[in-house]
Interface confidence: low
């Protein structure tokens, strides 16, 4: 997804509209594109992204990409269509309610990516494997 092409400021956040002015309702995601991050060696991190967007297309989900190289750490938060690759990777976990980071092979850097489909789910990025099975919050969302 390209960053929102038309935006309205609402409570310091942004809401995305299409060319007809219709606001796409389905998914609310953090959408700060690429920002420098201090998230490192933690089980989970908050995105520290103050922009919540309603995704441009109804089918889009939330995505977070964490990258570390010799110089810096960045965190990318966007909306993206799970039918399309992102950074050359398929969004395998797009149906998950939580953004559980999985490492991907990228030369010259450490690269983690997650996708999820609950409101603002890319605000809290999870590196700990224990969240896959033992987190009661996650179980509640899935099974309630």
């Amino acid at each position: 997804t390209i960053p929102p092409h038309v935006q309205k400021s609402v409570n310091n956040d942004m809401i995305v509209t299409d060319n007809n002015g219709a606001v796409k309702f389905p998914q609310l995601c953090k959408f700060c594109d690429v920002r420098f991050s201090t998230c490192d060696n933690q089980k989970s991190c908050m995105s520290n992204c103050s922009i919540t967007s309603i995704c441009e297309k109804p089918q889009e989900v939330c995505v977070a990409v964490w990258r570390k190289n010799d110089e810096n750490i960045t965190l990318e938060t966007v909306c993206h269509d799970p039918k399309l690759p992102y950074h050359d990777f398929i969004l395998e976990d797009a149906a998950s309610p939580k953004c559980i980071m999985k490492e991907k092979k990228k030369p010259g850097e450490t690269f983690f990516m997650c996708s999820c489909s609950s409101d603002e789910c890319n605000d809290n990025i999870i590196f700990s494997e224990e969240y896959n099975t033992s987190n009661p919050d996650l179980l509640l969302v899935i099974f309630q």
């Epitope: 609402v10 409570n11 310091n12 956040d13 942004m14 809401i15 299409d18 219709a22 606001v23 796409k24 309702f25 389905p26 998914q27 609310l28 103050s50 919540t52 967007s53 309603i54 109804p58 989900v61 797009a94 149906a95 309610p97 489909s117 609950s118 409101d119 603002e120 789910c121 605000d123 919050d137 509640l140 969302v141 309630q144």
Partner: antibody, heavy 122, light 107 residues
Framework: EVQLVESGGGLVQPGGSLRLSCAAS????????MTWVRQAPGKGLEWVSV????????YYADSVKGRFTISRDNSKNTLYLQMNSLRAEDTAVYYC???????????????WGQGTLVTVSS | DIQMTQSPSSLSASVGDRVTITCRAS??????LNWYQQKPGKAPKLLIY???SLQSGVPSRFSGSGSGTDFTLTISSLQPEDFATYYC?????????FGQGTKVEIK
């Protein structure tokens, strides 16, 4: 069990203000977007407003924009609707409802409160 | 705003009847269509989401179909507890507008 309980309705004069509350329990409140929907006596359902889980994003129906403010206190598991400059046409039962988180159900409101009646009359 | 038009606005039927309610959107909404049931003095209840998926706990006699602009709610065999008002709602764009409702009454 998911429960939503509205309060704060009542009789108010035109031009007056009212604040509705919706106490939520039985689910993780702060990860769900919440909505207000109203129903005038003998009429159909009208969507009023939505607020994201963090409270960062809000949206309003044109009929209430600039007069109503939706907000939430996640520490209290409570949703609010501040209604100012009330008009006779705002008379309705106001429902708070939870917006589903499931991907294919997103946008649907899967749980509703019992509603609270707001009457605007002189 | 997307306009949602339901038909009929009311209908009379008997227990055991097959009942069909239609909902038309003013523009394509893909499958972002939900159906609610409301009984007098009560809050609406979600029956069908995403045009054809049955909400948990809803009897299988309720079914939904359609995509794009035309949608249908069917009650295969009307039961006494089904007499109520039914609303469609699009959740494709904000505001998520409702149809005007269809009241199902006892014949």
């Amino acid at each position: 069990e998911v429960q939503l309980v509205e309060s704060g309705g009542g009789l108010v004069q035109p031009g007056g203000s009212l604040r509705l509350s919706c106490a939520a329990s039985g689910f993780y409140f702060d990860i769900y977007a919440m909505t207000w929907v109203r129903q005038a006596p003998g009429k159909g359902l009208e969507w009023v407003s939505v607020i994201s889980g963090s409270g960062g994003t809000t949206y309003y129906a044109d009929s209430v924009k600039g007069r109503f403010t939706i907000s939430r206190d996640n520490s209290k598991n409570t949703l609010y609707l501040q209604m100012n400059s009330l008009r006779a046409e705002d008379t309705a039962v106001y429902y708070c409802a939870r917006r589903s988180q499931y991907r294919d159900k997103v946008g649907a409101t899967d749980y509703w409160g019992q509603g609270t009646l707001v009457t605007v009359s002189s | 705003d997307i306009q949602m038009t339901q038909s009929p606005s009311s209908l009379s039927a008997s227990v055991g009847d097959r009942v069909t309610i239609t909902c038309r959107a003013s523009q394509s909404i893909s499958s972002y269509l939900n159906w609610y049931q409301q009984k007098p003095g009560k809050a609406p209840k979600l029956l069908i989401y995403a045009a054809s998926s049955l909400q948990s706990g809803v009897p299988s006699r309720f079914s939904g179909s359609g995509s794009g602009t035309d949608f249908t709610l069917t009650i295969s065999s009307l039961q006494p507890e089904d007499f109520a008002t039914y609303y469609c709602q699009q959740s494709y764009s904000t505001p998520p507008t409702f149809g005007q409702g269809t009241k199902v009454e006892i014949k």
